[in-house]
Interface confidence: medium
């Protein structure tokens, strides 16, 4: 039960996280104009990964896309790449985790396969979250560097003359959305990995005591059971008895006089 809850919660947290990463990637406010000396401006500039915008006091807003690819800073391209990789990995992870959910039965999919898929999606969520956090952090570092460079330029006036005006940009809402979303995806991934660890052992413990020997001629060997964690070669969950290996289906098709525990 706890494993199902952990897996379900991990899925939901990751889902929220990935939705947040997508939202952050699409948002225009990655960097917003620093209103250091004028808290209410007539014109407010802000920039995203894909376009930059200007909003006026009249309400008029225009955004223009970055139509060049080669002319963009390498760092911006890197941030774009990290965010896209994060979204793609997260989306695949979500798809895999849906089939891995313990509460959803799909055909005759065994729990070892679900454990495998849970771990895979967990790792994908972790990498997705790290990509998002890395992307946002790289952009934030870029902003900090540019901010202090433009601040230095602002105050290098000589002989009573002031240098040309420079617009400084500071952290936009998208950065905080990205950091939180990346963190949630990361946490969700860790929860999925924890759920995976609990999936297989819980099942094998149950199966180890599920069956009794069908007759006196067959001696039950507790040590003979090979636990399947989903990573070994015993993927068929075969129970090993002295009387030969029989599959789970075979055991169930010959009920003994003993009741199941």
């Amino acid at each position: 039960m706890a494993v199902t809850a952990c897996q379900g919660l991990g899925f939901v947290v990751s889902l929220i996280g990935i939705a947040g990463i997508i939202a952050a990637t699409c948002m225009d406010q990655w960097s917003t104009q620093d209103l250091y000396n004028n808290p209410v401006t007539a014109v407010f500039n802000y920039q995203g990964l894909w376009r930059s915008c200007v909003r006026e006091s009249s309400g008029f807003t225009e955004c223009r896309g970055y139509f060049t690819l080669l002319g963009l800073p390498a760092m911006l391209q890197a941030v774009r790449a990290l965010m896209i990789v994060g979204i793609v990995l997260g989306a695949i992870g979500l798809l895999v985790s849906i089939f891995a959910l313990k509460c959803i039965r799909i055909g005759s999919m065994e729990d070892s396969a679900k454990a495998n898929m849970t771990l895979t999606s967990g790792i994908m969520f972790i990498v997705s979250g790290l990509c998002a956090i890395a992307g946002v952090s790289v952009f934030a570092n870029m902003l900090v560097t540019n901010f202090w460079m433009s601040t230095a330029n602002m105050y290098t006036g000589m002989g009573g003359m002031v240098q040309t005006v420079q617009t400084r940009y500071t952290f936009g809402a998208a950065l905080f959305v990205g950091w939180v979303a990346g963190g949630l995806t990361l946490i969700g991934g860790v929860m999925m990995c924890i759920a995976c660890r609990g999936l297989a052992p819980e099942e094998t413990n149950y199966k180890a005591v599920s069956y009794h020997a069908s007759g006196h001629s067959v001696a039950y060997k507790p040590g003979g059971f090979k636990a399947s964690t989903g990573f070994g070669s015993n993927t068929k969950n075969k129970k090993i008895y002295d009387g030969g290996a029989r599959t789970e289906d075979e055991v169930q098709s010959y009920p003994s006089k003993h009741d199941y525990v």
Partner: antibody, heavy 122, light 110 residues
Framework: QELKESGGRLVTPGGSLTLTCTAS?????????MCWVRQAPGKGLEWIAC????????TYYATWAKGRFAISKTSSTTVTLQMTSLTAADTATYFC???????????????WGPGTLVTVSS | AYDMTQTPASVSEPVGGTVTIKCQAS??????LAWYQQKPGQPPKLLIY???TLASGVPSRFKGSGSGTQFTLTISDLECADAATYYC????????????FGGGTKVVVV
Amino acid sequence: QELKESGGRLVTPGGSLTLTCTASGFSFNSNYYMCWVRQAPGKGLEWIACIYGGTTVNTYYATWAKGRFAISKTSSTTVTLQMTSLTAADTATYFCAREDLTAYSSYVITLWGPGTLVTVSS
Amino acid sequence: AYDMTQTPASVSEPVGGTVTIKCQASETIYRNLAWYQQKPGQPPKLLIYAASTLASGVPSRFKGSGSGTQFTLTISDLECADAATYYCQQAYTRVNIDNAFGGGTKVVVV
């Protein structure tokens, strides 16, 4: 970077006139608003209208200029001001001006043309 | 709506003196105010924007202050070259306004 006005001349009352502003050294873009400001002889500056330099069409007019004056972009380097129903009160030097939106975060005029004189007289 | 009132209309001061020009907005424009200097036969030149920030190449003798509706331009250590007409301009909105500029102040340096 320069602005140059043209089209100013003597006009009779009730007449119409179109002024043209040509930019050199830069082209209109989303960082700018292109404006017209006038100054009657011996009087102060009077703002008339502005047009956005970006792709979206956005214009602003002084309340008194709406209807009689029309600002438009004819190319990426030229802006015009169409004036109708002119009176003697419209006699002034008409300046073409550029507001630098992005850098100054407000409607600050950073570049002016030398002006063109419009005289309305019979 | 957003009318700009400039005082005085003219002022006369000796070289080395100080001139103070006031500008009042009918509604708050926060710090979105610019000051221009215009000499006869020339177009205006930007001096100050954002109420107190000096434009490129403007000497520090020019000082802007104020916010909201009350603004001041102070010119200290007056020079002959400062003789001109000074205009304030609200740079906050372009919607429903009669004129963005104040009436102007003529500064005479004696």
